[in-house]
């Protein structure tokens, strides 16, 4: 279909427009352009005949038009009167007519606008301001911007006069902003320079800072006054009603109790003529005493005693505060405060309650802290630890054992060998030991303050021969591709080398195998079924060596995708169908069958005697391993043909 596209549709005065023809028929006699929406000889602009290549101007030709061979019409130096419709009339070579109409609009280029205002210094909550965008231009859209944002929605903002006038009713200080107007038409847009609205306001009620009204004798009093105001306010200070000075700040050094009283700041705005005052009452106090903490139990026993801490001195109408470890009191059922907060009780103290503790007295002007107090909580002894952890020693070496038990006050230690007291020391030392030094070594820890004792026994074996080691495991039935297993070679022996074998071979190099703890521990990461082997550990020193019994790792795996046998899928009618399903799995999986989606028996073998074509369908074997929690399945299609209908069919079992 013949169409006309105006490029551009909206044309600026003085510019040009192209009436571009689309889908012009191929074989043409000629074409003609008309001003208006129809073919009218009196409004013909120009005609063009293909055969003669002759362009003939019409009555509406202005000399600004150029016609192109593709029938498009260029109009130059556009004037306002060019706005409207244009019709192209095409005569095809068979003298059949076609016509299409296009249009464009002409707009003037806009000048840069400016803003005029009816009030350059409006007063807050009193005046209105009307901004007008100049000049008035026909067919132009007027827009307004406040701080480069579009106008906010507000009942105090009103647009009128075709949006050319913006009125702000009852101006506020928040209307102090940058205002711009913009004129737009389809061919141009221009913004004015910004106009800053200067709203006179205030003064608001002044604010006196700092806010504290209580001071200590001897401090400096430095008060500052501020009131929001435009232009800035002028300030005056009054003490107990008597004028002091006309400054924004009031400074009195080294105040005394006599400086207590009412302090008034007055703010004045000379443009609005308004005054506002604020009064603050200042109290000057003499120096209060420093607090301290007393305790009802200086050496409480862990899990037995309670402790009451009291903040001294007792002062009426005083707020008491507490801190533990430089933090405010934690919430705990073991911490209790008295009604006046002066006494802090710790119920059933623990070794972690040592502190430090501080109390504070709060008065009108500050908080005074006590010195910190630390609680001496008696505890222990805990079960002693004997080090080193070796249990096997070679003859001729020195035996040096150390014992430690957490305790306050520190524990007193005693050593016993096979029940006989040896010495009252924390360390036991025997040089050049022999097999006779084998036995039970006991460490006893005693807390004299609490009267509690605790013991630990260790078996020491002195032998030239190393014992036969054994393997302990942290996971007896790991799952394939999921679990890790750590084997540890027991016992821990001094000056001993630990070795490992897998299936009688030394350890293979593998990123999944890791030795640690002086080679005493072998870790297998992400076990696989191939890790189900015999593991042996060995210990050796310069005089002997020994190997453990093998430990076989039982890796749980599967079930893998099952296999149905025999592989045949075509059977003759009358044959027996005997299908067997197998899946690699540890432990062995549970088997079940489905025929055409219908559950059958829970067996590894499916047997159907004398099958017929009715037994056609899908045979699915399902396997599940309860230990690994995994399932698998396979589907096989079985076709049963009537006897003798198709070659190559299995006769069945």
């Amino acid at each position: 279909k013949l169409t006309i596209e105006s490029t551009p549709f909206n044309v600026a005065e003085g510019k040009e427009v192209l009436l571009l023809v689309h889908n012009l028929p191929q074989h043409l006699f000629g074409y003609s352009w008309y001003k208006g929406e129809r073919v009218d000889g009196n409004r013909q602009i120009i005609g063009y005949v293909i055969g003669t290549q002759q362009a003939t101007p019409g009555p509406a030709y202005s000399g600004r038009e150029i016609i192109y061979p593709n029938a498009s019409l260029l109009i130059q130096n556009i004037i306002q009167n060019d706005t409207g419709f244009y019709t192209l009339h095409v005569i095809k070579s068979d003298l059949v007519n076609e016509e299409a109409t296009g249009q464009f609009r002409v707009y003037p280029e806009l000048p840069k606008p400016s803003i005029s205002s009816n009030n350059s210094k409006p007063v807050e909550d009193k005046d209105a301001v009307a901004f007008t965008c100049e000049p008035e231009t026909q067919d132009a859209t007027y827009l307004w911007w406040v701080n480069n944002q579009s106008l906010p929605v507000s009942p105090r903002l009103q647009l009128s006069n075709g949006n050319r006038t913006l009125t702000l009713f009852n101006v506020t200080r928040n209307d102090t902003a940058s205002y711009k107007c913009e004129t737009q038409n389809p061919v141009s847009a221009r913004r004015s320079d910004s106009v800053i609205l200067n709203v006179l306001y205030g003064p608001d009620a002044p604010t006196i800072s700092p806010l504290n009204t209580s001071y200590r004798s001897g401090e400096n009093l430095n008060l500052s006054c501020h009131a929001a105001s435009n232009p800035p306010a002028q300030y005056s200070w009054f003490v107990n009603g008597t004028f002091q000075q006309s400054t924004q700040e009031l400074f009195i050094p080294n105040i005394t109790v006599n400086n207590s009283g009412s302090y008034t700041c007055q703010a004045h705005n000379s443009d609005t003529g308004l005054n506002r005052t604020t009064v603050t009452t200042i109290t000057v106090y003499a120096e209060p005493p420093k607090p301290f903490i007393t305790s009802n139990n200086s050496n409480p026993v862990e899990d037995e005693d309670a402790v009451a801490l009291t903040c001294e001195p007792e002062i009426q109408n005083t707020t008491y505060l507490w801190w533990v470890n430089n933090q405010s009191l934690p919430v705990s059922p073991r911490l209790q405060l008295s009604n006046d907060n002066r006494t802090l009780t710790l119920l059933s103290v623990t070794r972690n309650d040592v502190g430090p503790y501080e109390c504070g007295i709060q008065n009108e002007l500050s908080v005074d802290h006590s010195d910190p107090v630390i609680l001496n909580v008696l505890y222990g002894p805990d079960d002693p630890t004997i080090s080193p952890s070796y249990t096997y020693y070679r003859p001729g070496v020195n035996l040096s054992l150390s014992c430690h038990a957490a305790s306050n006050p520190p524990a007193q230690y005693s050593w016993l060998i096979d029940g006989n007291i040896q010495q009252h020391t924390q360390e036991l030392f025997i040089s050049n030991i022999t097999e006779k030094n084998s036995g039970l070594y006991t460490c006893q820890a005693n807390n004299s303050a609490s009267g509690h004792s605790r013991t630990t026994v260790k078996t020491i074996t002195v032998s030239a021969e190393l014992p036969k080691p054994s393997i302990s495991s942290n996971n007896s039935k790991p799952v394939e591709d999921k679990d890790a297993v750590a084997f540890t070679c027991e016992p821990e022996a001094q000056n001993t080398t630990y070795l490992w074998w897998v299936n009688g071979q030394s350890l293979p190099v593998s990123p999944r195998l890791q030795l640690s703890n002086g080679n005493r521990t072998l870790t297998l990461f992400n076990v696989t079924r191939n890790d189900a082997r015999a593991y042996v550990c060995g210990i050796q020193n310069s005089v002997s060596a020994n190997r453990s019994d093998p430990v076989t790792l039982d890796v749980l795996y599967g079930p893998d995708t099952p296999i149905i046998s025999p592989p045949d899928s075509s059977y003759l009618s009358g044959a027996n169908l005997n299908l067997s399903c197998h899946s690699a799995s540890n432990p062995s999986p549970q088997y079940s069958w489905r025929i055409n989606g219908i559950p059958q028996q829970h067996t590894q073998v499916l047997f159907i005697a004398k099958i017929t074509p009715n037994n056609n369908g899908t045979y699915a074997c399902f396997v599940s391993n309860l230990a690994t929690g995994r399932n698998n399945s396979i589907v096989k299609s079985i076709t049963v043909s009537a006897s003798g209908t198709s070659p190559g069919l299995s006769a069945g079992a």
Epitope: F29, G41, N42, Q44, T56, I91, S93, D94, V96, N97
Partner: antibody, heavy 121, light 106 residues
């Protein structure tokens, strides 16, 4: 001065053939579209056919389509109408006419005086 | 095909009269309408093309108007030489004529 002169009319039996000619002068024939219009005795005008300046474009009224052929010889400034399978209703005065060089929309600005074709047994 | 209907078929008028002949198309033909005058024994003569454009050399008492389906030929002041038969022709496809209007002296 534009002149169009038709010839070749006469009496012909039904089913017979006739060839009309139109000699043109006074304008650039080779760049002008041409046409034939007929008028049965005592009846109105009926457009018959038209042809483009280069002969490649031809149009016919449904009543003559397949029987009449319009053609031109620009070297002789002559327009033709070959009429075959003539019928009694083809009896009319046949006018040769010119479409002007600024033809918006198509119209016939010069006509010949016509030639009479009578189809009768 | 587009049918053209002229009315009236015949018309009697006197010299100096204003005469109007109408032509109606069976479907819209935009401004593609021409008017012709034919005197007895003569070839037709073009008066108006494109519904309202006066052919060169035709007196200005002849005027045409209309678009779409309804068109009018007006003779503002009838002259003795104007008595003839008038045909409208649509310039669409095919270029069919109206049946004619015979203008006679009253």
């Amino acid at each position: 001065e534009v002149q169009l002169l038709e010839s070749g009319g006469g009496l012909v039996q039904p089913g017979g053939s006739l060839r009309l000619s139109c000699a043109a002068s006074g304008f650039t024939f080779s760049s002008s579209y041409m046409g034939w219009v007929r008028q049965a005795p005592g009846k109105g005008l009926e457009w018959v056919s038209s042809i483009g300046s280069g002969s490649y474009s031809t149009s016919y009224a449904d009543s003559v389509k397949g029987r009449f052929t319009i053609s031109r010889d620009n070297s002789k400034n002559t327009l033709y109408l070959q009429m075959n399978s003539l019928r009694a209703e083809d009896t009319a005065v046949y006018y040769c006419a010119r479409y002007p060089s600024v033809p918006f929309p198509p119209h016939l600005d010069y006509w010949g005086q016509g030639t009479l074709v009578t189809v009768s047994s | 095909d587009i049918q053209m209907t002229q009315s009236p078929s015949s018309l009697s008028a006197s010299v100096g009269d204003r005469v109007t002949i109408t032509c109606r198309a069976s479907q819209s033909i935009s401004s593609y309408l021409n008017w012709y005058q034919q005197k007895p024994g003569k070839a037709p003569k073009l008066l108006i093309y494109a519904a309202s454009s006066l052919q060169s050399g035709v007196p200005s008492r002849f005027s045409g108007s209309g678009s779409g389906t309804d068109f009018t030929l007006t003779i503002s002041s009838l002259q003795p030489e104007d008595f003839a038969t008038y045909y409208c022709q649509q310039a669409g496809n095919p270029h069919t004529f109206g049946q004619g209007t015979k203008l006679e002296i009253k």
